[in-house]
Every structure is written in C-alpha cells, then in structure tokens.
C-alpha cells in the first residue's frame, strides 16, 4: 500500500492496489479518487490533477462510489398497480412495489417490474397458500364438512355449522342451514381471513444498478483495486 500520506493522484507501488474509494486510471497510470454517491466524474484524473466530480442532474443518480462519466437514469414512474416506496434522488433509484391485493410477477434487483392481481378463490374453494410479495394465492377445493361462499384472495374453507336438525345440508360453497333457531355450536361464526401480503422493501441494502442500465459493473466492486473505468378467479 502507498504511504499513509499519499494524496490522489499517486502512482501505486509495484504489486499494490489503490485504496478504498480510489480507482486505478489506466491512462494516467495513477490511483485517483472515486466520486461519492450522488456524484459522477466530470473530469477524469491526470498525472497531476485528481478526478473532478459533479452532482447528478435531476432524475439521475449514483448509489455507489464511482467514476462513471454520467449518472444513471432513474426508472420510469410507478404504474397504477404499484406504489413508490423509494423516491428518485441523486443517491438512489426510484423503487416501485406492488400495491395491496397484487403480487410481483416479475421482479428486479430492487422493487418490481410487473405486478399482477392476487388470484381470488371462487365459492367452493378456499385459500390453501396465501399470496406473498412475490407469489400468487393458491386455491384448493373445500374438503367435505367445510365451505367457502365468497370470492376472495384471503378466505379459507370454514367448517359447516353443526345443527341439532339440518334443514339444508352444507356443501363446498354453502354452509349448512339449521331448522332450530340456533345451532348447537358454530365452528366458525365469522369469515376467516388470511393476512394480506404487505409490500415491503428490504432495509439497509444498497442496491446496484442493473447491468443493462450501467456502463459496466466494474465500478460497483467495493473492495476491488479498481480495474479500468467502465462502466384471477378460479382454482
């Protein structure tokens, strides 16, 4: 490693690497400063002058220490089936997640590219597996002795009420009807709901731009010696 008082730009000692938050500029053959998140390289370093950084313009960002010539463009505005869980700033991209009642059918590194409505189980079917942020509801036919009379993405099959005298037997989509004024007991007097999946975004991660939107991924390597600059209803 270079002497502790080395200021950028400096020539690294043979076999050594540049320090963290620095990169090796092949043209200058010097270790030079990276730009901090929210900035980009306006002027690359030379043998005698360090990198000149500038703030990202509106609707663009950099999330990492970098030496990209231009900031990355923030993603497009969230669609109507999404909510913006992170705004576009100079240091972070916009993140869109699915709104309640929807799940992410096609995800990206952070947030969701394509949302789809959660399947609704029709009468005679109940929720076997609830929907999550990234998976749809799975429905199953109500087993004998249970029913569901709703079209719902959260209701499970409920037991038929127990009658002293049955007026109308229950089936998969209808509860039993009793002749007496009240049943001896009701296994499930109210609708049973499964919790709706809540769209959340992972905390304290610092996502990197997708390769398709970044000049290259080399500037994303935090510990590198900094190689050259990039770049339904139914069942």
């Amino acid at each position: 490693l270079p002497a502790q008082v080395a200021f950028t730009p400096y020539a690294p000692e043979p076999g050594s690497t540049c320090r963290l938050r620095e990169y090796y500029d092949q043209t200058a053959q010097m270790c030079c400063s990276k730009c901090s998140p929210g900035q980009h390289a306006k002027v690359f370093c030379t043998k005698t002058s360090d990198t000149v950084c500038d703030s990202c313009e509106d609707s663009t960002y950099t999330q990492l220490w970098n030496w990209v010539p231009e900031c990355l463009s923030c993603g497009s505005r969230c669609s109507s089936d999404q909510v913006e869980t992170q705004a576009c700033t100079r240091e972070q991209n916009r993140i869109c997640t699915c709104r309640p009642g929807w799940y992410c059918a096609l995800s990206k590194q952070e947030g969701c590219r394509l949302c789809a409505p959660l399947r609704k189980c029709r009468p005679g079917f109940g929720v076997a597996r609830p929907g999550t942020e990234t998976s749809d509801v799975v429905c199953k036919p109500c087993a004998p002795g249970t029913f569901s009379n709703t079209t719902s993405s959260t209701d499970i099959c409920r037991p038929h009420q127990i009658c002293n005298v049955v007026a109308i037997p229950g089936n998969a989509s209808m509860d039993a009807v009793c002749t007496s004024t009240s049943p001896t007991r009701s296994m499930a007097p109210g609708a049973v709901h499964l919790p709706q999946p809540v769209s959340t975004r992972s905390q304290h991660t610092q996502p990197t731009p997708e390769p398709s939107t970044a000049p290259s991924t080399s500037f994303l390597l935090p510990m590198g010696p900094s190689p050259p600059a990039e770049g339904s209803t139914g069942d």
């Epitope: 502790q4 990492l64 220490w65 304290h204 610092q206 080399s218 390597l221 935090p222 510990m223 590198g224």
Partner: antibody
Framework: QVQLLESGGGLVQPGGSLRLSCAAS????????MSWVRQAPGKGLEWVSG????????FYADSVKGRFTISRDNSKNTLYLQMNSLRAEDTAVYYC????????????WGQGTLVTVSS | DIQMTQSPSSLSASVGDRVTITCQAS??????LNWYQQKPGKAPKLLIY???TLQTGVPSRFSGSGSGTDFTFTISSLQPEDIATYYC?????????FGQGTKVEIK
C-alpha cells in the same frame, strides 16, 4: 429475508485443510463484495479475506496469505473459503459477511461456523 | 496497517445511564469508521457507519461522532438489552481493522 448461512466448519489437525461455504439468500448476491471475518474463542474480530462482487479481485490478511483462498460462485449465490496448512491459531468462529457498498463495513453477517485446529 | 485502539476495554453502568466508548485510529481515517454490537453467542450487528450514520432499524439511543483519528460511540440511555461487546472498525483502507472491543455490563 436477507440471510447468510455458513457451513463446513469442524475439527481438523494442524496442517490439514477445510473448505467453508456461505449460502446467500434474499439479496442480489452478485452485486456485493463479500468477506470472511473470524473470532478466536474469547477474543475480538479479525478480518480474514475479501472478494469483489464479480470475483475478480481478492484480498487477504497477512496472517492467512498464501494459505487461504477466497472464491465465489455467483450462479449458486455461494461464497467459499479454502483453508490449507491450518494452524492452531486459526481456531475461531468464521463469519461470512456482506460488504456495505457505501461504507465498506459489514452490514449482513452469517451465524458463524466453528473451526477447531487441534491434534 | 491501521491500528484501532478502543477504550475502555470494559465498563459497568446502570440502566438509564449515558455510556461512552472511544476509538482512536493510528492515522487519519476521515469519517470511515463503523460501530458494531455483538451479543454473547451471536454474530456482530452493524449499528453505525461512516462515523455517525445510524443503520436502518437501529434505535436512536445509539449515536456516533468524530473524524480523523478520534471517534466516540454513545448510548444515551442504557437498556438491559444493550448488554454486549461493542467494536469499532475502520474502513478507510484494506486491510480493514477492528478495535479490541468494549464489554458493556449492567451494574
């Protein structure tokens, strides 16, 4: 959720070898540099090795240089540490840790795997 | 390599007390200092990075300050769940290095 799970620790004789693995889930593994940090029984934390997000650049503490090799398989979301010529002083809990790309601290840690080097 | 010196090595305080730990670097590390909490038998947890930035989800009673070579970590009102060993770590350059740790106990 974001998780790191180490495996491969155990008892080994001096001079022997072990390979540690760290399975990552819940985040874009290929976008993050990763590290191994160890902690000898009753002692403090010691950084052992690091690897860049793409795997092209590797770094080692002087105490393990030439004996340990860090690698990663981004297709399997797995980090490795091949440990050869093990010594008694390598006895420690080995943690796999994700490198925070802004601060270069370690923001996600595994639960650790114990490596005991003893005859 | 950059040496990190933490003090004290251990301390005992009462619930509600203000607790301060210091960390000194052997050379200028600017603001690139991180603080971790490690409870017995558990992995360390990042509390503060870049000297003073609180990691997401960390209670606001934890704070950090300093730059250059001298840094301070503070628990404004010690809670029973704060019993742990706290480590500083410099991330100015590789190899990243840790302080020796400060064990915090309840009186």
């Amino acid at each position: 959720q974001v998780q790191l799970l180490e495996s491969g620790g155990g008892l080994v004789q001096p001079g022997g070898s072990l390979r540690l693995s760290c399975a990552a889930s819940g985040f874009s593994f290929s976008s993050y540099a990763m590290s191994w940090v160890r902690q000898a029984p009753g002692k403090g934390l010691e950084w052992v090795s690091g690897i860049s997000a793409g795997g092209g650049e590797t770094f080692y503490a002087d105490s393990v240089k030439g004996r340990f090799t860090i690698s990663r398989d981004n297709s399997k979301n797995t980090l490795y540490l091949q440990m050869n010529s093990l010594r008694a002083e390598d006895t420690a809990v080995y943690y796999c840790a994700r490198v925070h790309p802004i601060s270069y601290g370690f923001d996600i840690w595994g639960q650790g795997t114990l490596v005991t080097v003893s005859s | 390599d950059i040496q990190m010196t933490q003090s004290p090595s251990s301390l005992s305080a009462s619930v509600g007390d203000r607790v301060t730990i210091t960390c000194q670097a052997s050379q200028d590390i600017k603001k690139y200092l991180n603080w971790y909490q490690q409870k017995p038998g558990k992995a360390p947890k990042l509390l503060i990075y870049d000297a003073s930035t609180l990691q997401t989800g960390v209670p606001s009673r934890f704070s950090g300050s300093g730059s250059g070579t001298d840094f301070t970590f503070t628990i404004s009102s010690l809670q029973p769940e704060d019993i742990a060993t706290y480590y500083c770590q410099q991330s100015d350059n590789t190899p990243v290095t840790f302080g020796q740790g400060t064990k915090v106990e309840i009186k």
